[in-house]
Amino acid sequence: LTCLGGFASPGPVPPSTALRELIEELVNITQNQKAPLCNGSMVWSINLTAGMYCAALESLINVSGCSAIEKTQRMLSGFCPHKVSAGQFSSLHVRDTKIEVAQFVKDLLLHLKKLFREGQFN
């Protein structure tokens, strides 16, 4: 166990494993989607660049009452080095563009698959 900030935290998950698990969860969401995901909630689109994990969570954190993305939100928190608050916006948000959560998840999934293929795990 590693001691971090007063907690005995679990040993770090290898980034490749964490990324693969996030991809698998996003695949699971897109494949099991029957009704509109999160009741068709809209979120801010983001630029899929460095820092996108925090930006993605900043967008998704504003979606309330959507059990389908709870696991995704938890996984994204593991990639984001700082605590994200509702209503917080990073420079990566495309501020005038909102998309449905389902589309957001699909876009994120495509980008993460590309990163995984290229070996960019962090």
Partner: nanobody, 127 residues
Framework: QLVESGGGLVQPGGSLRLSCAAP????????IAWFRQSPGKEREWVSC????????IYSDSVKGRFTISRDNAKNTLYLQMNSLRAEDTAVYYC??????????????????????WGQGTQVTVSS
């Protein structure tokens, strides 16, 4: 804000069920985590359950022995602890950050913190 109960003295191999209640807010609206702290050690994350109950996660040290669950009608969260060992002896705390999702265990201590805690309940595993 949170109140734990159900601790006590139990023999190795025995079981206990801890409860976490919140008199002042609706536990069913939030993800809840359990932590524990034994004398002279850092507080250790144990388990977490999301608001819907669809995401439950456990530390490797308790996986397969502990089960986290919730009864939203009773505004109560539970930690069922089976096959208890001496090393499970600790004060157990429940915590929330009034979010619907659990925080990734690897993020704890790196800025991802829970802001609402109980006072803890003592669990002692000894013959």
């Amino acid at each position: 804000q949170l109140v734990e109960s159900g601790g006590g003295l139990v023999q190795p191999g025995g079981s206990l069920r801890l409860s976490c209640a919140a008199p002042r807010f609706t536990l069913g609206s939030y993800a809840i985590a359990w932590f524990r702290q034994s004398p002279g050690k850092e507080r250790e994350w144990v388990s977490c359950i999301s608001r819907s109950g669809g995401d439950t996660i456990y530390s490797d040290s308790v996986k397969g022995r502990f089960t986290i669950s919730r009864d939203n009608a009773k505004n109560t969260l539970y930690l069922q602890m089976n096959s208890l060992r001496a090393e499970d002896t600790a004060v157990y705390y429940c915590a929330t950050d009034k979010r619907s999702f659990c925080y990734a265990p690897e993020g704890l201590g790196k800025g991802w913190t829970y802001d609402y805690w109980g006072q803890g309940t003592q669990v002692t595993v000894s013959s």
